[in-house]
Structures are given as C-alpha cells and as structure tokens.
C-alpha cells in the first residue's frame, strides 16, 4: 500500500488536492521524496476506481493515514519499496 520511490525524474504532479479519500477506496500510495530534479515531496494516490490523484503532503488526513500505515507495516503490510535510480 505504501511505496517510497527515489527517482531522478522531474516533478510528477502538476496540481495537488487536499480532499480526503477514505482508505477503503485507496489501492496504493506512492511517496516521491524531494530532490533529484523535483524540489518538493510528492504523494501520489492510486484509487480503487483506477484513477490517480496527487495529494498535498501537508493535508492532515494524508499525514495521519501514512502514520497509521507505517505503524502497521511491520506486521500487516508489505515492506515499502525503495527504488533509487542510478544517475
């Protein structure tokens, strides 16, 4: 559910939403840390209806949700995927 990617791509998100999405409608969450061509952290949410949305990392609900998912990750979720692209 929770994936962290380190890439050398530029920013993926053109616009961001802060509108709440319940967990049950979320397929997975991608976190793209700042750096490597993008000056900001990006969060991409893949929804159960196959649509994708960029979420404002400052949105309270996504911060809370990621904290819950991190706490669960050791026992109930796959280990987050870390990918570093070789320059």
């Amino acid at each position: 559910v929770l994936e962290v990617y380190y890439t050398s791509l530029r920013c993926r998100c053109v616009q961001e939403s802060s509108v709440f999405i319940p967990r049950r409608f979320i397929d997975r969450i991608q976190i793209l840390p700042r750096g490597n061509g993008c000056p900001r952290k990006e969060i991409i949410v893949w929804k159960k209806n196959k649509s994708i949305v960029c979420v404002d990392p400052q949105a309270e609900w996504i911060q809370r949700m990621m904290e819950v998912l991190r706490k669960r990750s050791s026992s109930t979720l796959p280990v987050p995927v870390f990918k570093r692209k070789i320059p």
Epitope: V19, F20, I21, P22, R23, R24, F25, K47, K48, N49, S51, W61, R64, M65, V68, R72, T76
Partner: antibody
C-alpha cells in the same frame, strides 16, 4: 434528525432502465460520501456503489460496472442511481446510506427505508 | 476482494442467553469492521463500529471484539427485542458484508 428517503423503485423488464433518488435532510449533505446498498428478497446486504463529496469520484461493485451510474446534486441534497441494462439478479430493495467518515473509521451510520426494484418480464 | 464469512447462519436462543456471532475476513482488515442489526422490513441499524465502539443509544449488552481476521459480536443477555438478523461489514477495502446471522427465539 438525519433523514434519507429513497424513491423511484418499481417493476421493470429485463434490459430496461430505472433511476432511483434519495432525498437527504438533517445534515450537511455535501460533507459526506454517500452509498447505495441493496438487498435481494430474503438475502443479505450487498454494497453497490459509492460517491465522494462533489461527485467527482465514484466506485462500483464489479457486477454493476458499466450498467449503473451513481451521481449527486448537492444543491438539491439528492443522491441518484441510474440503472441501465437491468437483469433479474438486480431485483432488490435499494437503500441509500450516508458514509460518515474520517480516515475510514466510521461507515454507513444512517440509512433510508429502501425502495424496491423488481426486474421481471 | 475481501470475503467475509459469518457464522452461524442461524441461531436459536432464549431470553437471557449469552450469544456470540463470529465474522472471519479472508485477509487482514485490522479493526475496520462494523456490526448491524436488521429487523424484517426495516433498514439496517448500526450497532458497533471500528470493531468495538458502541453506537450511541445501543444497549451495553452488545459488545464487539477482534482484530485482523477474526471478529465477534456478543450479546451478554438476550432481550426480546434482540431477535433479528445481524451482519458484519468490512470497510478496509471497498465494502463486503457477511452473509448474516438470523437470531431466532428457541
């Protein structure tokens, strides 16, 4: 007091169409995700579809995808379910439900009385 | 898709009995489970949400427990108005209801 009142049910032939409505009152309608749940005669409950606050996001069970469309009109405090290509197995009481929600914790706390849809020739 | 297996499908009991209904999820749903009571011709009524939080106005004889894949609804001392059908609902990934448990008077 939260109230949900469904309407639009009735008898329809296989392949036909029907549009259900749900009138909401007693709460700020646009603050909630909403859902349709159905129950075939003598059977259990089955989630059909959900819609987000502004109607921009919709979700369906596999068996109704491409045939049913959930929508809402926040100005009218109304939820809709357009049902096309109806089949005998769609026969059920259809309930409108409010998805009280934050972080996925509370769900379907308020329900309407239901409206019966019968698909038969 | 997550499947919910509810048992028993029917249950006969007497007023004053302690009754337990079980719901098993096909995968981990943490505590994202709700219990409903439904009487004939009526809409479902939410009893318990988040596995063990009692809905306001629901008598304390109802309680819920569990986590992960196994959940229980317990009625500590059956009252005449408790004879109904009970459903569990997982809300971890979309929605899936259990098949229901019909609680009848013995």
């Amino acid at each position: 007091e939260v109230q949900l009142v469904e309407s639009g049910g009735g008898l329809v032939q296989p392949g036909g169409s029907l549009r259900l409505s749900c009138a909401a009152s007693g709460f700020t309608f646009s603050d909630y995700y909403m859902a349709w749940v159905r129950q075939a005669p003598g059977k259990g409950l089955e989630w059909v579809a959900s819609i987000n606050y502004d109607g921009g996001d919709t979700y369906y069970r596999d068996s109704v995808k491409g045939r049913f469309t959930i929508s809402r009109d926040n100005a009218k405090n109304s939820l809709y379910l357009q049902m096309n290509s109806l089949r005998a197995e769609d026969t059920a009481v259809y309930y409108c439900a409010r998805e009280e929600d934050y972080d996925g914790s509370y769900v379907m706390d308020a329900w309407g009385q239901g409206t019966l849809v019968t698909v038969s020739s | 898709d997550i499947q919910m297996t509810q048992s028993p499908s029917s249950l006969s009991a007497s007023v004053g009995d302690r009754v337990t209904i079980t719901c098993k999820a096909s995968q981990n749903i943490n505590k994202e489970l709700t219990w409903y009571q439904q009487k004939p011709g009526k809409a479902p009524k939410r009893l318990i949400y988040n596995t063990n939080i009692l809905q306001t106005g629901v008598p304390s004889r109802f309680s819920g427990s569990g986590s992960g894949t196994e959940f229980t609804l317990t009625i500590s001392s059956l009252q005449p108005e408790d004879f109904a059908t009970y459903y569990c609902l997982q809300q971890s990934s979309l929605y899936t209801f259990g098949q229901g448990t019909k609680l009848e008077i013995k």
